[in-house]
């Protein structure tokens, strides 16, 4: 079994974590993808997920989490904006492939958020304005059930994370089409 590896990212409150998880294009382009936090005892919990099937370059926002799936690049981009100290923890990208177990993307992200002002460009990035809200009467929960296997037989492509501005080729130019998805009614 492959050992699960971690990459550590130390950021200040108010900054944005920008994670790019690579996946195999042909296999998973339209599969639903999710961002999970790993609780103590290897207990992943889904915080946000893309639509099903996952739409290309179509941002989905859940709270301070923004997911964008770039099919042409085989890339799930996850941003956590306006980071708080309480956001510190271990995270992972996964691909849902029911009825099989979710497919974990490496590496896991060990996020450490500390207090203190940061003048880093984009640290106060306000990408949550002009958000279209789905009515609260929505009854369908988007994130499916899951458990996560404790062993991985084959290492999927690595994930990468940074706090820089977006790569020019996947730059988000229009934040007005972000969808705010209530996971429960």
């Amino acid at each position: 079994a492959t050992k699960l590896t971690e990459e550590k990212y130390e950021l200040k409150e108010g900054q944005t974590l920008d994670v790019k998880c690579d996946y195999t294009l042909e296999k998973f382009a339209s599969s639903q993808k999710a961002w999970q936090i790993i609780r103590d005892g290897e207990m992943p919990k889904t915080l946000a997920c893309t639509e099903r099937p996952s739409k290309n370059s179509h941002p989905v926002q859940v709270g301070r989490i923004i997911l964008e799936d770039y099919h042409d690049h085989g890339l799930l981009r996850v941003r956590m904006v306006n980071l708080q100290v309480e956001d510190s923890g271990l995270y992972q990208c996964v691909i849902y492939q029911p009825p099989k177990e979710p497919h974990m993307l490496f590496d896991r992200i060990r996020l450490v958020v500390t207090k203190g002002f940061s003048g880093t460009p984009g640290s106060n990035e306000n990408s949550t304005q002009n958000v279209y809200k789905i009515p609260p009467t929505t009854t369908k929960a988007l994130c499916p059930l899951y458990t996560s296997p404790r062993t991985v037989t084959q290492a999927p492509p690595k994930s990468t994370a940074d706090v820089s501005t977006p790569d020019s080729e996947i730059n988000l130019t229009n934040v007005t089409d972000i969808i705010r998805v209530p996971v429960f009614n």
Epitope: I37, R39, D40, G41, E42, M43, K45, T46, L47, A48, V62, G63, R64, I65, M80, Q84, E86, D87, E101, A141, C143, P144, L145, Y146, T147, S148, P149, R150, T151, V183, F184
Partner: antibody
Framework: QVQLVQSGAEVKKPGASVKVSCKAS????????MHWVRQAPGQGLEWMGV????????SYAQKFQGRVTMTRDTSTSTVYMELSSLRSEDTAVYYC?????????????WGQGTMVTVSS | DIVMTQSPLSLPVTPGEPASISCRSS???????????LDWYLQKPGQSPQLLIY???HRASGVPDRFSGSGSGTDFTLKISRVEAEDVGVYYC?????????FGGGTKVEIK
């Protein structure tokens, strides 16, 4: 319908061990985490730990670390909670409870409880 | 560990009247996804606990709409708009923000 059925009441002597079972039905057993919560007579609820029936991984409350073991048998959709080195303070009703799937971590289905009495 | 504090300890109520229970956490229960990981349970006499409210304000399936949950961060409230005789029991709040999960001490609701 979704159901958790627990084993019957137990009477144990101090120092002994007890193993309580919780049989799940009406849903996909491996898709939901299972928690154990106990309640001493006239007291509140106390979280003991959680098991992932899919992979078997566990997380225990510090207080029970080293004394509690949670296991599962996927062939019978049953989880077990074993508590060792019993003392009188362990006299309580022990509940298994399913953690809701998806984003919520609420305990949405509970077993009927198993009364464990520790007495010499 | 996150400490959950409930008040009042006991709440005598009159049927048809409103009731309110408070729950405070030692740390924020608001997750990055915008949800508060705070749940409310009712344990009726001689029964197992039952889920009333999850994620701070979402009513569980089959729960009457006289029950509502509100609050964010560290301060939460469970309200019963018009108490009925069947609502008696002990109410607990629980945080599921992080392991170990922790419960409030409970509030006993009884008819005056």
């Amino acid at each position: 319908q979704v159901q958790l059925v627990q084993s019957g009441a137990e009477v144990k002597k101090p120092g002994a061990s007890v193993k309580v079972s919780c049989k799940a039905s009406g849903y996909t057993f491996t898709s939901y985490y299972m928690h154990w919560v106990r309640q001493a007579p006239g007291q509140g609820l106390e979280w003991m730990g959680v098991i992932n029936p899919g992979g078997g991984s566990t997380s225990y409350a510090q207080k029970f670390q080293g004394r509690v073991t949670m296991t599962r048998d996927t062939s019978t959709s049953t989880v077990y909670m074993e508590l060792s080195s019993l003392r009188s303070e362990d006299t309580a009703v022990y509940y298994c409870a399913r953690e809701a799937g998806q984003t919520s971590s609420a305990l949405d289905v509970w077993g009927q409880g198993t009364m464990v009495t520790v007495s010499s | 560990d996150i400490v959950m504090t409930q008040s009042p300890l006991s709440l005598p109520v009159t049927p048809g009247e409103p009731a309110s229970i408070s729950c405070r956490s030692s740390q924020s229960l608001l997750h990055s996804n915008g949800y508060n990981y705070l749940d409310w349970y009712l344990q009726k006499p001689g029964q197992s606990p039952q889920l009333l409210i999850y994620l701070g304000s979402h009513r569980a399936s089959g729960v009457p709409d006289r029950f509502s949950g509100s609050g964010s961060g560290t301060d939460f409230t469970l309200k019963i708009s018009r108490v009925e005789a069947e609502d008696v029991g002990v109410y607990y709040c629980m945080q599921g923000r992080q392991v170990p999960f922790t419960f409030g001490g409970g509030t006993k609701v009884e008819i005056k």
